[in-house]
Amino acid sequence: ARSEDRYRNPKGSACSRIWQSPRFIARKRGFTVKMHCYMNSASGNVSWLWKQEMDENPQQLKLEKGRMEESQNESLATLTIQGIRFEDNGIYFCQQKCNNTSEVYQGCGTELRVMGFSTLAQLKQRNTLKD
């Protein structure tokens, strides 16, 4: 299979020129997570968008000082979130705006699920909600 096939979005169309990994992260509260975007071209800065499941329109991610950090080299952009919290739950998208064409390319997204049901009662409640 072509490498692009691994990054297809649910509708089946390949995300143009930018590949995001992983597609899903589940970690306990307090852990550090990293998500990556691989680009064909380094001719543009990468920004990060974020949305809750119930949100239709992703918003630009404001990097919380001391807890969130973005880095970018030639073909790789990385978002690091330390000490993850429940409010970090959601889907994160990288977005590259190309310098020469002004075109915007967006990754398929990384879903972050923050876990941390610390008591049996909370686990039971979660299972009840699922049922």
């Epitope: 809750q52 119930m54 949100d55 409010e87």
Partner: antibody
């Protein structure tokens, strides 16, 4: 230049439903969040809720039980209905467009005063 | 529930610098927006994304952010700057919109 224009009755009786429409001109209604915000006389701004072109809505929790929003992309319009109104709902009602990928408002209607009185 | 807190009023002499603060628990994670509202008019966006200025807004308007507080600064205040100023942001989920109570700027 995008323009927004609110329209609807300026007087509503208590316990009835307030209905307003916002018409968007000189721009597409697609791919934006469209919001309603109100301001009682001499007081601050209060967010009522938003609707996306797909019909997805988010409402202020304090008003959620009384608010319904709808959108008609073919007419470039979106609407607000607020049920069971009281005098406390008397305010200037604004419609506003949310900046794409942000949660602030770049274009506002001029506002329409709605008075709740018998 | 999240709230945004502003001082009710700020007074400043012409030519001086006015600073209006807005504090809220979600501000480290959510961008802030500032609006100017003059009597009988709709609000006008003067600062977005904490510190960016829309085209057409004078350079004397600037914004900054530090932790749970954002600040609107008006340098060299002019008589026409007298108005109500509202900060606005979202809760931590980015879903629900919040407004501060507003600050009346009086130019002495």
């Amino acid at each position: 230049q995008v323009q927004l224009q609110e329209s609807g009755p300026g007087l509503v009786k208590p316990s009835e439903t307030l209905s307003l429409t916002c018409t968007v001109s000189s721009g597409s209604i697609s791919s934006y969040y469209w919001n309603w915000i109100r301001q009682p006389a001499g007081k601050g701004l209060e967010w009522i809720g938003r609707i996306y072109t797909s019909g997805t809505t988010h409402y202020n929790p304090s008003l959620k039980s009384r608010v319904t929003m709808s959108i008609d992309t073919s007419k470039n319009q979106f609407s607000l209905k607020l049920s069971s109104v009281t005098a406390a709902d008397t305010a200037v009602y604004y419609c506003a467009r949310e900046i794409r990928e942000l949660r602030g408002f770049d274009y506002w209607g001029q506002g329409t005063l709605v008075t709740v009185s018998s | 529930s999240y709230e945004l807190t502003q001082p009710p009023s700020v007074s400043v002499s012409p030519g001086q610098t006015a600073r209006i603060t807005c504090s809220g628990d979600a501000l480290p994670r959510q961008y802030a927006y500032w609006y100017q509202q003059k009597p009988g008019q709709a609000p006008v966006l003067v600062i977005y994304k904490d510190s960016e200025r829309p085209s057409g807004i004078p350079e004397r308007f600037s914004g900054s952010s530090s932790g749970t507080t954002v600040t609107l600064t008006i340098s060299g205040v002019q008589a026409e700057d007298e108005a109500d100023y509202y900060c606005q942001s979202a809760d931590r989920t980015g879903i629900y919109v919040l407004f501060g109570g507003g600050t009346k700027l009086t130019v002495l």
